[in-house]
C-alpha cells in the first residue's frame, strides 16, 4: 500500500517521514502510532504490532500526542501563596496562580517559582500603577486636592469633598471635614479600588517594576484581602 493509506506499523518510503500522530521507531524501523493526550506507550511497536497505549495513572498526565513510556508527574500541590486554577488531570498539569494581592516575583521557564506580596501605598500616597501578574504596585504622592487615608495595594488618591463651610481642610492623607451636612465632591471620585492582578502563570514543579521612588520587588509574605490559608489543594 502507498504510505499515505498504510496502517501502522509500516515502513516509510526511503527518505520519507511518518504521518501526523505517528513516530519512527528506531528499533522496529517502522512508522508507529503515537498515544493520545492522557495516555502513554505501554508497549512499543514491533514490525508486526502497533504501539499499545494505556491511560495515565493518578497524578500523572500527558498533554500531547506522545510515545513516552511513562506519563509526566503533575507538579506538587500549590503553595499557600498560590491558588489552583486548573486541577491535575490525565491530559494536563496542575496550574497554580498567584493569589490576589500577589505577583510573580521570580518566574521560571514555565510558570512562577515564587509569588510575592504586592507592596502597599502608605496614607498620603495612592496607587499610580496597579500590580500585574509580573510587576509590583507603583505608588505616587496624592496631588493637592486629593487624599488617601489607607495603607493599601489597590486604593488610588481620591478628591477631597468640597464643603460649604470647611471645618478641617483636607490634606494628602485626610479628607476635608465639613460643617455642613451636604458636602459635594470636587469631581467624580471614580473607582476607589483598582483590580487585583490576574495571574495566568502556571507552576509545574515545587513551589517556591521599577517604581518611581524605591526600587525592587515585593516579597513573600501574604497580604490581604486573600492571604494564604494553611494547607493547599490536592489532586
Amino acid at each position: 500500500l502507498p504510505a499515505q493509506v498504510a496502517f501502522t506499523p509500516y515502513a516509510p518510503e526511503p527518505g520519507g517521514t511518518c504521518r501526523l500522530r505517528e513516530y519512527y521507531d528506531q528499533t522496529a524501523q517502522m512508522c508507529c502510532s503515537k498515544c493520545p493526550p492522557g495516555q502513554h506507550a505501554k508497549v512499543f511497536c514491533t514490525k508486526t504490532s502497533d504501539t499499545v497505549c494505556d491511560s495515565c495513572e493518578d497524578s500523572t498526565y500527558t498533554q500531547l500526542w506522545n510515545w513516552v513510556p511513562e506519563c509526566l508527574s503533575c507538579g506538587s500541590r500549590c503553595s499557600s501563596d498560590q491558588v489552583e486554577t486548573q486541577a491535575c488531570t490525565r491530559e494536563q498539569n496542575r496550574i497554580c496562580t498567584c493569589r490576589p494581592g500577589w505577583y510573580c516575583a521570580l518566574s521560571k521557564q514555565e510558570g512562577c517559582r515564587l509569588c510575592a506580596q504586592l507592596r502597599k501605598c502608605r496614607p498620603g500616597f495612592g496607587v499610580a500603577r496597579p500590580g500585574t501578574e509580573t510587576s509590583d504596585v507603583v505608588c505616587k504622592p496624592c496631588a493637592p486636592g486629593t487624599f488617601s487615608n489607607t495603607t493599601s495595594s489597590t486604593d488610588i488618591c481620591r478628591p477631597h469633598q468640597i464643603c460649604h463651610v470647611v471645618a478641617i481642610p483636607g490634606n494628602a492623607s485626610m479628607d476635608a471635614v465639613c460643617t455642613s451636612t451636604s458636602p459635594t465632591r470636587s469631581m467624580a471620585p471614580g473607582a476607589v479600588h483598582l483590580p487585583q492582578p490576574v495571574s495566568t502563570r502556571s507552576q509545574h514543579t515545587q513551589p517556591t517594576p521599577a517604581p518611581s521612588t524605591a526600587p525592587g520587588t515585593s516579597f513573600l509574605l501574604p497580604v490581604g484581602p486573600s492571604p494564604p490559608a494553611e494547607g493547599s489543594t490536592g489532586d
Partner: antibody, heavy 124, light 110 residues
Framework: EVQLVESGGGLVQPGGSLRLSCAAS????????INWVRQAPGKGLEWVGI???????NFANWAKGRFTISRDNSKNTLYLQMNSLRAEDTAVYYC??????????????????WGQGTLVTVSS | DIQMTQSPSSLSASVGDRVTITCQAS??????LAWYQQKPGKAPKLLIY???ILTSGVPSRFSGSGSGTDFTLTISSLQPEDFATYYC????????????FGGGTKVEIK
C-alpha cells in the same frame, strides 16, 4: 510613635499553656502582617508564625498544631497562644511588624519595628 | 523550604576594619533579603531591606549587595557601636517554612 509591646511571659511547667500579648500603638494592627519571632538563650532568631491582614495565620513547621495567633482589632492587640509547652520553647518572644515604611511604600518583607520581647521559661 | 546559611558564625575585628558577612539562600530569592543588627538584651534592628536599601537612620558605612542566592553585608569601617550579632532574613512564609533567618554572625572585638 510606632511601637509594639509584648507581655504575658513568665514561668510555666512543661505541658502547660501560656498566652502572650502584643500591643500596638501608632498604627493599626489590622493593616499590617504581624510576626512572632523567638530567641532561645544564647541562640539565634527563629520565626514562629504570622497573622496576615485578612486574619489568616501561618506557622513554622515546628509550631503548627501547638501555637495559634489571634488579633483583637478593638484593642489593637495581638496574641500568641502556646500549648503543650516544652523546655525547648524557653525563649524571648518578640512580635514584629511585617512592613517597613519608606517613601510612600510599605515593604512587607522587612520586619520593623520589633517589640522589646517577653521571656518565657518552661521548667518544672 | 528556603534555608539561609550565614557565614562566618563569628569573627573578631578591630575598630576601623572592613567586615564582610555573607548569607546564602538554598534557592533563588531575587533581591528579597533583609539584614538585622542585634545587641545583647535588645530586640533586632532592621538595617537593610531588598538586599541593598539602607534603612533610614542607619550609617552609610553599612551596605548590602547580592541577588539570587548570594548576599553580602559589608561594614566599611567598623565602629565601637557595631560590635553585635547580625542576621539575614528571607521572609517567605508559605506552607513549608522552618525558619526565615540565617544562623547569625557575631562580630567581636579583636
Amino acid at each position: 510613635e510606632v511601637q509594639l509591646v509584648e507581655s504575658g511571659g513568665g514561668l510555666v511547667q512543661p505541658g502547660g499553656s501560656l498566652r502572650l500579648s502584643c500591643a500596638a500603638s501608632g498604627f493599626s494592627l489590622s493593616t499590617y502582617d504581624i510576626n512572632w519571632v523567638r530567641q532561645a538563650p544564647g541562640k539565634g532568631l527563629e520565626w514562629v508564625g504570622i497573622i496576615y491582614t485578612g486574619g489568616i495565620t501561618n506557622f513554622a513547621n515546628w509550631a503548627k498544631g501547638r501555637f495559634t495567633i489571634s488579633r483583637d482589632n478593638s484593642k489593637n492587640t495581638l496574641y500568641l497562644q502556646m500549648n503543650s509547652l516544652r523546655a525547648e520553647d524557653t525563649a524571648v518572644y518578640y512580635c514584629a511588624r511585617g512592613g517597613y515604611d519608606s517613601e510612600g511604600y510599605v515593604y512587607p518583607d522587612a520586619f520593623d519595628p520589633w517589640g522589646q520581647g517577653t521571656l518565657v521559661t518552661v521548667s518544672s | 523550604d528556603i534555608q539561609m546559611t550565614q557565614s562566618p558564625s563569628s569573627l573578631s575585628a578591630s575598630v576601623g576594619d572592613r567586615v564582610t558577612i555573607t548569607c546564602q539562600a538554598s534557592e533563588s530569592i531575587s533581591n528579597l533579603l533583609a539584614w538585622y543588627q542585634q545587641k545583647p538584651g535588645k530586640a533586632p534592628k532592621l538595617l537593610i531591606y531588598r538586599a541593598s536599601i539602607l534603612t533610614s537612620g542607619v550609617p552609610s558605612r553599612f551596605s548590602g549587595s547580592g541577588s539570587g542566592t548570594d548576599f553580602t553585608l559589608t561594614i566599611s569601617s567598623l565602629q565601637p557601636e557595631d560590635f553585635a550579632t547580625y542576621y539575614c532574613q528571607h521572609g517567605y512564609t508559605g506552607t513549608n517554612v522552618q525558619n526565615v533567618f540565617g544562623g547569625g554572625t557575631k562580630v567581636e572585638i579583636k
